[in-house]
C-alpha cells in the first residue's frame, strides 16, 4: 500500500481551523493478524529525507496522536489530551485519515507528516509516510478561508475551503 497526500500545501488565516488529510491507497490486508498504526508529527524543512525527524505538534508527540486499529476501521484519538491542545486525529473505513487543528496561529506553520505502519504479528512492519506544508498567514490580505493546493499541481491551481 501507499500513502497519498491530496494536498501538498494548505494556506490558512490565523484563527481558522484546518484538517490535514492523508489517504491509504492500494490493497489493505484486513486479516486478524494485521493492525495499522497511524499518526501525525511535524518535521523540519529541507531535509534530504523528508519526515525523518519527528517533532511534536502543539507539544503532543506522535505517540500522543496515534490511532491503532484493524484494516479500514474507523478510529479517533483519545479526546481529552488532544482536544485540550485543539487537535483531533481521525480515520475512516475508506482509508482516509486526518488531523484537525483548531484556532491556528502563526506557530502552526510548517511541514506536517502522516505515518502509517502496517503491523503483521510475527512478521516485519511496513511503514510509509506523506508530507504536506501548512502556512498560517497573518495580515489584512491573508485569505479569509483556508486555501488548499493539490499535490499534482506545482503552480497556481488552488481550491478555497469553506
Amino acid at each position: 500500500f501507499k500513502v497519498a497526500t491530496p494536498y501538498s500545501l494548505y494556506v490558512c488565516p490565523e484563527g481558522q481551523n484546518v484538517t490535514l488529510t492523508c489517504r491509504l491507497l492500494g490493497p489493505v490486508d484486513k486479516g486478524h493478524d494485521v493492525t495499522f498504526y497511524k499518526t501525525w508529527y511535524r518535521s523540519s524543512r529541507g531535509e534530504v529525507q523528508t519526515c525523518s525527524e519527528r517533532r511534536p505538534i502543539r507539544n503532543l508527540t506522535f505517540q500522543d496522536l496515534h490511532l491503532h486499529h484493524g484494516g479500514h476501521q474507523a478510529a479517533n484519538t483519545s479526546h481529552d489530551l488532544a482536544q485540550r491542545h485543539g487537535l483531533e486525529s481521525a480515520s475512516d473505513h475508506h482509508g482516509n485519515f486526518s488531523i484537525t487543528m483548531r484556532n491556528l496561529t502563526l506557530l502552526d506553520s510548517g511541514l506536517y507528516c502522516c505515518l502509517v505502519v502496517e503491523i503483521r504479528h510475527h512478521h516485519s512492519e511496513h511503514r510509509v509516510h506523506g508530507a504536506m506544508e501548512l502556512q498560517v498567514q497573518t495580515g489584512k490580505d491573508a485569505p479569509s478561508n483556508c486555501v488548499v493546493y493539490p499535490s499534482s499541481s506545482q503552480d497556481s491551481e488552488n481550491i478555497t475551503a469553506a
Partner: antibody
Framework: QVQLVQSGAEVKKPGASVKVSCKAS????????MHWVRQAPGQGLEWMGR????????VYNQNFNDRVTMTRDTSTSTVYMELSSLRSEDTAVYYC????????????WGQGTTVTVSS | DVVMTQSPLSLPVTLGQPASISCRAS??????????MNWFQQRPGQSPRRLIY???NQGSGVPDRFSGSGSGTDFTLKISRVEAEDVGVYYC?????????FGQGTKLEIK
C-alpha cells in the same frame, strides 16, 4: 526545485520608471508571499515591500510608498516591481525573495536585477 | 522602525578558527514567544542566502558549523571553524514586523 528568475539589467534616465519581473517555478505560486529587497553598490540590504500573489495584496516600505508598485500575473507565475521617478540613488541590484511563514523569513532569492540610473 | 546594529563591521579570521557576529535590535523582536531574527550570507557577486531563521534554526543545506543564539534584542551568529567558502558579508534581519529591517552587514575575510 524552487526557482526565482529575474529579468535582465536595465539602464534608465532620471525621472523614468523601471519594471523588474520575477518568474517563479517549482512551487504553488499563489501560496507564498513575495518580497523585494534592494542593494545599492557597496551597501547593505533594504526591504522594499511584499505582495501576496493569491489576492494581489501589498505592503510597502514607507520610504518607497509613493514610488513603488508591486503586481502579479498568476497565469505566468510572475511578480513585478515597478519603481517610478527614478533618481541616481536608485541605482542598485533588486532582488525578489520568497517568504515563508514557517519561521518568517525569505527562503529563496532571485539572482538579482541591476538597475542603473544615469543621465 | 526597528534599527538593527551589527558588530563588528569587518571581521578578519584565520582559517579553522571560530568567528562570532553580534546583532542588536533597537526593540524586542519576540512574537509568540519566539525571536524572529534571521541571518543571511552573501558571498561576493551572489544573492543573499538564508543561514539561520527564527534565531537558531538552520536553513536547509547550511553546514552545522553555523549556529545562532539570543533572544529579545541581542543575537549572535557563530561559525565554529571558518572555511574559505565562508568569505562574504553576513546580515541579520528582524521579521517581527514590517519594515523588515537588516543590519549594516559584517564583512568576513580570511587573515
Amino acid at each position: 526545485q524552487v526557482q526565482l528568475v529575474q529579468s535582465g539589467a536595465e539602464v534608465k534616465k532620471p525621472g523614468a520608471s523601471v519594471k523588474v519581473s520575477c518568474k517563479a517555478s517549482g512551487y504553488p505560486f499563489t501560496g507564498y508571499f513575495m518580497h523585494w529587497v534592494r542593494q545599492a553598490p557597496g551597501q547593505g540590504l533594504e526591504w522594499m515591500g511584499r505582495i501576496n500573489p493569491y489576492n494581489g495584496g501589498t505592503v510597502y516600505n514607507q520610504n518607497f510608498n509613493d514610488r513603488v508598485t508591486m503586481t502579479r500575473d498568476t497565469s505566468t507565475s510572475t511578480v513585478y516591481m515597478e519603481l517610478s521617478s527614478l533618481r541616481s540613488e536608485d541605482t542598485a541590484v533588486y532582488y525578489c525573495a520568497r517568504w515563508t511563514f514557517d519561521g518568517l523569513f525569505m527562503d529563496y532569492w532571485g539572482q538579482g536585477t541591476t538597475v542603473t540610473v544615469s543621465s | 522602525d526597528v534599527v538593527m546594529t551589527q558588530s563588528p563591521l569587518s571581521l578578519p579570521v584565520t582559517l579553522g578558527q571560530p568567528a562570532s557576529i553580534s546583532c542588536r535590535a533597537s526593540e524586542n523582536v519576540d512574537k509568540y514567544g519566539i525571536s524572529f531574527m534571521n541571518w543571511f550570507q552573501q558571498r561576493p557577486g551572489q544573492s543573499p542566502r538564508r543561514l539561520i531563521y527564527a534565531t537558531s534554526n538552520q536553513g536547509s543545506g547550511v553546514p552545522d558549523r553555523f549556529s545562532g543564539s539570543g533572544s529579545g534584542t541581542d543575537f549572535t551568529l557563530k561559525i565554529s571553524r571558518v572555511e574559505a567558502e565562508d568569505v562574504g558579508v553576513y546580515y541579520c534581519q528582524q521579521s517581527k514586523e514590517d519594515p523588515y529591517t537588516f543590519g549594516q552587514g559584517t564583512k568576513l575575510e580570511i587573515k
